[in-house]
Interface confidence: low
């Protein structure tokens, strides 16, 4: 382990859910540290996670500036001897550029995964049930406020509701491009619900995992004649 050779990062992977975005890579460092750079296609490189011994870098703050941009990222492997504290340059004593590895390009609006949704509430009025999906907050900002998933995706985002009688396994579905469903139910029957977020226009990462199941007769629901 006395070697001073640096090892280029590999297995660069974007992990992104609801725009919370982390770049991960291998290997754990020996005799070296890492620095990450990110840029848009037309912008300058910005350095993040200076001289880290970790194998991940949270780039959320950068990508939420414009989630419809395309981002490039790269991971530099820096010899420990060149990473003295307070040194602002990435480069060694002779000015050579340390080895780096490029991540695949990342388009947050297209590539971030949809987080597991949550059923906020359901309310029965006669033979109708109104099911409301929680509009999850993201880390995307506009005018100093955090936008919700619906704010960001608008009508690109739909929800699919799966519902069934507690006494049977036959599922029905409903869809909405708001965060609410109004469905018909049989009076006197208890129903269970689960929702899934979907962006139909995508080719990958189209669907979230299903929400936890909520059933009538539990605390989240209300019943009114």
């Amino acid at each position: 382990s006395g070697t001073t050779n640096t090892v280029a990062a590999y297995n660069l992977t974007w992990k992104s859910t609801n725009f919370k975005t982390i770049l991960e890579w291998e290997p754990k460092p020996v005799n070296q540290v890492y620095t990450v750079q990110i840029s848009t296609k037309s912008g300058d490189w910005k350095s993040k996670c200076f001289y880290t011994t970790d194998t991940e870098c949270d780039l959320t703050d950068e990508i939420v500036k414009d989630v419809k941009q395309t981002y490039l990222a790269r991971v530099f492997s820096v010899p420990w001897r060149n990473s003295t504290h307070g040194k602002e340059t990435l480069f060694g004593t002779h000015g050579e550029e340390p080895p780096f590895t490029n991540a695949r390009k990342f388009l947050p609006y297209r590539d971030t995964k949809l987080g597991q949704p949550t059923i906020q509430s359901f309310e029965q009025v006669g033979t109708k049930v109104n099911v409301t999906v929680e509009d999850e907050r993201t880390l995307v900002r506009r005018n100093n406020t955090f936008l919700s998933l619906r704010d960001v995706f608008g009508k690109d985002l739909i929800y699919t509701l799966y519902y069934w009688k507690s006494s049977s396994s036959g599922k029905k579905t409903a869809k909405t491009n708001t965060n609410e469903f109004l469905i018909d139910v049989d009076k006197g029957e208890n129903y269970c619900f689960s929702v899934q977020a979907v962006i139909p226009s995508r080719t990958v990462n189209r669907k979230s995992t299903d929400s936890p199941v909520e059933c009538m007769g539990q605390e989240k629901g209300e019943f009114r004649e």
Epitope: S1, G2, K15, P27, K28, V30, N31, E56, W80
Partner: antibody, heavy 124, light 108 residues
Framework: QVQLQQWGAGLLKPSETLSLTCAVY????????WSWIRQPPGKGLEWIGE???????RYNPSLKSRVTISVDTSKNQFSLKLSSVTAADTAVYYC??????????????????WGKGTTVTVSS | EIVLTQSPGTLSLSPGERATLSCRAS???????LAWYQQKPGQAPRLLIY???SRANGIPDRFSGSGSGTDFTLTISRLEPEDFAVYYC?????????FGGGTKVEIK
């Protein structure tokens, strides 16, 4: 002096989910990896997985489909969940700190602080 | 997966004797990632050696580590009564991190 205190249910039925938590006292989560290791009765040690302070995880492929390790920096603790347990999951479960240590020109990784262990028995 | 094979499985020795424990890897292991642990009954493992050679804080100098590549050795130069325990080698360079099966050092 960093200490790890762990707790969780000790007796489970098959198909239930094992849930253990490890709290870090006297130090920070930041800058380290945090591991879970288990030891079946009378057998050797098996690494389950680890998590960095910012949430990145590595899991043992043999358990990956059933394991979730999470971190709560506000409480200075990390947790293990193992779903669909069977009798084969009966073991003493340890949490440990995996330290990246710089010494004489190199990085070394080793588990230098361990919890006392939690005995988990899976039985119907 | 890197398999670590420890030998012998059991070592029967008397206090004052020298103990030599072997750890063989199925694939090359960077010595930076090779550690040795001691475990006594009912206790958690305790770090002895990291980076194949370096003693952890508070570990007496009768414990030493050596080796590289696929062959590593833990040596206890003169066994003390408190040294009778199970010893494990571990690699933390390749996922899954693996431990050897252990060597039990028992009193003869």
């Amino acid at each position: 002096q960093v200490q790890l205190q762990q707790w969780g249910a000790g007796l489970l039925k098959p198909s239930e989910t094992l849930s253990l938590t490890c709290a870090v006292y006297g130090g920070s989560l930041s800058g380290y990896y945090w591991s879970w290791i288990r030891q079946p009765p009378g057998k050797g040690l098996e690494w389950i997985g680890e998590i960095g302070a910012s949430g990145s995880t590595r899991y043992n492929p043999s358990l990956k489909s059933r394991v979730t390790i999470s971190v709560d920096t506000s409480k200075n603790q990390f947790s293990l969940k193992l779903s669909s347990v069977t009798a084969a999951d009966t073991a003493v479960y340890y949490c440990a700190r995996d330290t990246p240590y710089y010494y004489e020109g190199g990085y070394y990784y080793y588990m230098d602080v361990w919890g006392k262990g939690t005995t988990v028995t899976v039985s119907s | 997966e890197i398999v670590l094979t420890q030998s012998p499985g059991t070592l029967s020795l008397s206090p004052g004797e020298r103990a030599t424990l072997s750890c063989r890897a199925s694939d090359s292991v960077d010595s930076s990632y090779l550690a040795w642990y001691q475990q006594k009954p009912g206790q958690a493992p305790r770090l002895l050696i990291y980076g194949a050679f370096s003693r952890a804080n508070g570990i007496p100098d009768r414990f030493s580590g050596s080796g590289s590549g696929t062959d590593f050795t833990l040596t206890i130069s003169r066994l003390e009564p408190e040294d009778f325990a199970v010893y494990y080698c571990q690699q933390a360079g390749v996922v899954p991190y693996t431990f050897g099966g252990g060597t039990k050092v028992e009193i003869k």
